[in-house]
């Protein structure tokens, strides 16, 4: 039953293009190329690609012929390496390409940003846009490959051939529309939010990976799979993890090929085997491949099997729990986490592995002891605080939510997080807070039962953004202390952070505040976005400043922009009550 | 520092009933299982059968099931391998091993016994 | 009959890398890395070399490193030197409340 055993194959270009077909090789190459070069112009890419692939085709014609048995990476990193402008557009990152395999693959990959200086995407006109796909379909689709895939260089790349297939769909339908801006902007809209949502999941699986190591992600993993399979058992769930496993470690790896075909065999094994996994998967599996392994990744949690014993049973009140922990560690402990997992959907996975952690850590020191049942007898006493901990918190906040709305909810965190880490840039703190802030509406629309799955593990999240930006300036030794002793306790370690007391306030730089007539023409999203901005720039000033302080600068500043994008002269009008409202806020501030 | 000694060497006639002995000491002997390790002359490793002298429960492979008996003493931290009835194919060395985290992980083995069976 | 296949016999010159495979390893032991690899002198006891397909034991030279694709696990030794010249042999869990497999061993010779 192992999914993933193939023959050896003499060449594995062949091999994958054959497995994958052209038009996903193709695009598959185009994407791993653009989330390791992510400065190169997409004609160059689009060249480089188009060379790979005319050497996949020889390569499928003859097995033997002359480089066809060299490994991917060889393949793709020697290809990379001929990009002329490499040490202008990179720096360092040429140095990589004097390095042998698999030393060269490694040293690409840590060089992958998550923040590149890249333009925002500006959306075009509709019309603009519609005329683009129809005069070159092919071009117009690699090149939304290409955009996404160098601004999240770890993107899920067979999730993103998924996300283009529906964008292609997306302009295939409303470009014909009577009203093509209100057939398409709703759903281009759509596709940018759970594009985000999508990378930033994946993000967090990579940096799992790749900073915690296996063993944390395979333990995540059994914990998610149970909650979703809790009919399954153990040996399914356990096979369904390695498999899932070696196809994430594939893609956070770059090897975006070999993670494609092995997802691909992964659907095809699930759904084979349905009847051993879930009753859920049925429409799943109706699907053609893209859209099923999509479904599957997000489908909902099977029903529970009645009459699950008292998990007490098997793991605290049984006298063999020390030796049923001594024949296999690691087996037990996945035992224990499937059993647990399984019977509470109602638990984030992060929650389940603290629990676990804890459990581990006490037959550890149990087993080792005189009594050792004595001593392991009240573990599951350990387990309240635990579980009371995020139940409280998720209660405050969504009570809170529910009282000031998204926006407010928002300025709410971007005060606590500026105070609690002020050293972060001002970007960061905006962008992670502001997406704090949406797991309000998010989460707390769910009854009980769902509110701490979809919170603490959407909080994880969106703090491993917080974690991966940091990384690449630290600037906070409490958010690298934060972010790397403890992925599942990253979100306790940041809510127990209080004021940091050391922080010397900003100098006041009178610039910062002067704003012009160009927020007048900002959407509706981009103007909150100036106006948090000021906000956390407030906060650095002014650490001690009172929720009601703030609150009235805040309304001050609201009541300027709004009066100054009605005057018939704005800029004067920017410049002018601009003056007055700095000094005021300085006044209130007592700055 | 943890240590495995067994017994010594022993020669034996077919259809005898030797107990071989395997004694722990530096580490608690209760909470690791013990394996036993068969390897005739030329030939691999085999697992025989594992014991975790905790409560003494005990497994066999099942080419040994009803072969041999493996049985622990706690009080004395010491291990036990007993024939029903040796043959000449019996003739081996014999290891114990401790078992940690996993009963495949043998990290301290004893320095082996040799029984030669022959008539 | 070993559950878990390996080579008779394998050769390197020194100063060479060598991989000795051993496959067959069960799914369970597969997920939770449950391998092991021991080193053997003739006459002499065996020695945990790499456990859970890529750890080592405290003591044991970085030459010896472990890896695993599917349901087979790999030793590699690097820069042979000639006392590596002995039988190696792979272990792997085999299931619970079930006695652990080895495989039929493999001898290394240092040419």
């Known amino acids: 039953r192992g999914v993933f055993r193939r023959d050896a194959h003499k060449s594995e270009v062949a091999h994958r293009f054959k497995d994958l077909g052209e038009e996903n090789f193709k695009a598959l190459v185009l994407i791993a190329f653009a989330q390791y070069l992510q400065q190169c112009p997409f004609e160059d890419h689009v060249k480089l690609v188009n060379e790979v692939t005319e050497f996949a085709k020889t390569c499928v014609a003859d097995e033997s012929a002359e480089n066809c048995d060299k490994s991917l990476h060889t393949l793709f990193g020697d290809k990379l390496c001929t990009v002329a402008t490499l040490r202008e557009t990179y720096g360092e990152m040429a140095d990589c390409c004097a390095k042998q395999e698999p030393e060269r693959n490694e040293c690409f990959l840590q060089h992958k940003d998550d923040n590149p200086n890249l333009p925002r995407l500006v959306r075009p006109e509709v019309d603009v846009m519609c005329t683009a796909f129809h005069d070159n379909e092919e071009t117009f689709l690699k090149k939304y490959l290409y955009e996404i895939a160098r601004r999240h260089p770890y993107f899920y790349a067979p999730e993103l051939l998924f996300f283009a297939k529906r964008y292609k769909a997306a302009f295939t339908e409303c470009c014909q529309a009577a009203d093509k801006a209100a057939c398409l902007l709703p759903k281009l809209d759509e596709l940018r939010d759970e594009g985000k949502a999508s990378s930033a999941k994946q993000r967090l699986k990579c940096a799992s990976l790749q900073k915690f190591g296996e063993r944390a992600f395979k333990a995540w993993a059994v914990a998610r799979l149970s909650q979703r399979f809790p009919k399954a058992e153990f040996a399914e769930v356990s096979k369904l993890v390695t498999d899932l496993t070696k196809v994430h470690t594939e893609c956070c790896h770059g090897d975006l090929l070999e993670c494609a075909d092995d997802r691909a065999d992964l659907a095809k094994y699930i759904c084979e085997n349905q009847d051993s996994i879930s009753s859920k998967l049925k429409e799943c599996c109706e699907k053609p491949l893209l859209e099923k392994s999509h479904c599957i990744a997000e489908v909902e949690n099977d029903e529970m099997p009645a009459d699950l014993p008292s998990l007490a049973a098997d793991f605290v009140e049984s006298k063999d729990v020390c030796k049923n922990y001594a024949e296999a560690k690691d087996v037990f402990l996945g035992m224990f986490l499937y059993e647990y997992a399984r019977r509470h959907p109602d638990y984030s996975v992060v929650l389940l592995l603290r629990l676990a952690k804890t459990y581990e850590t006490t037959l550890e020191k149990c087993c080792a002891a005189a009594d050792p049942h004595e001593c392991y007898a009240k573990v599951f006493d350990e387990f309240k605080p635990l579980v009371e901990e995020p139940q409280n918190l998720i209660k405050q906040n969504c009570e809170l939510f529910e009282q000031l709305g998204e926006y407010k909810f928002q300025n709410a965190l971007l005060v606590r997080y500026t105070k609690k880490v002020p050293q972060v840039s001002t970007p960061t703190l905006v962008e992670v807070s502001r997406n704090l802030g949406k797991v309000g509406s998010k989460c707390c629309k769910h009854p009980e039962a769902k509110r701490m799955p979809c919170a603490e593990d959407y909080l994880s999240v969106v703090l491993n953004q917080l974690c991966v930006l940091h990384e690449k300036t630290p600037v906070s030794d409490r958010v690298t202390k934060c972010c790397t002793e403890s992925l599942v306790n990253r979100r306790p370690c940041f809510s127990a952070l209080e004021v940091d007391e050391t922080y010397v306030p900003k100098e006041f730089n009178a610039e910062t505040f002067t704003f012009h007539a160009d927020i007048c023409t900002l959407s509706e999203k981009e103007r909150q976005i100036k106006k948090q901005t000021a906000l956390v720039e407030l906060v650095k000033h002014k650490p001690k400043a009172t929720k009601e302080q703030l609150k009235a600068v805040m309304d001050d500043f609201a009541a300027f922009v709004e009066k100054c994008c009605k005057a018939d002269d704005k800029e004067t009008c920017f410049a002018e009550e601009g003056k007055k409202l700095v000094a005021a806020s300085q006044a209130a501030l007592g700055l | 520092e943890v240590q495995l000694v067994q017994s010594g060497a022993e020669v034996k006639k077919p259809g005898e009933s030797p107990k071989i002995s395997c004694k722990g000491s530096?580490?608690?002997?209760?909470?690791?299982?013990i394996g036993w390790v068969r390897q005739m002359p030329g030939e691999g490793l085999e697992w025989m059968g594992i014991?975790?002298?905790?409560?003494?429960?005990?497994r066999y492979s099942p080419s040994f099931e009803g072969q041999v008996t493996i049985s622990a003493d706690k009080s004395i931290s010491t291990a036990y391998l007993q024939w029903s009835s040796l043959k000449a194919s019996d003739t081996a060395m014999y290891y114990c091993?401790?078992?940690?985290?996993?009963?495949?992980?043998?990290?301290?083995w004893g320095q082996g016994t040799l029984v030669t069976v022959s008539s | 009959q070993s559950a878990l296949t390996q080579p008779a016999s394998v050769s390197g010159s020194p100063g060479q890398s060598i991989t000795i495979s051993c496959s067959g390893i069960s799914s369970l032991a597969g997920s939770y890395n449950l391998v092991s690899w021991y080193q053997q002198y003739p006459g002499k006891a065996p020695k945990l070399i790499i456990y859970e397909v890529t750890k080592r034991p405290s003591g044991v030279s970085n030459r010896f490193s472990g890896s695993k694709s599917g349901n087979t696990a790999s030793l590699t030794i690097s820069g042979l030197q000639a006392d590596d010249e002995a039988e190696y042999s792979c272990?792997?869990?085999?299931?619970?409340?079930?006695?652990?497999?080895f495989g039929g061993g493999t001898q290394l010779t240092v040419l």
């Open positions: 014991i975790y002298p905790g409560d003494s429960d005990t």
């Open positions: 530096g580490y608690s002997f209760t909470n690791y299982w």
């Open positions: 091993a401790r078992l940690h985290g996993v009963v495949s992980r043998g990290d301290y």
């Open positions: 272990s792997s869990y085999a299931g619970r409340n079930a006695v652990a497999v």
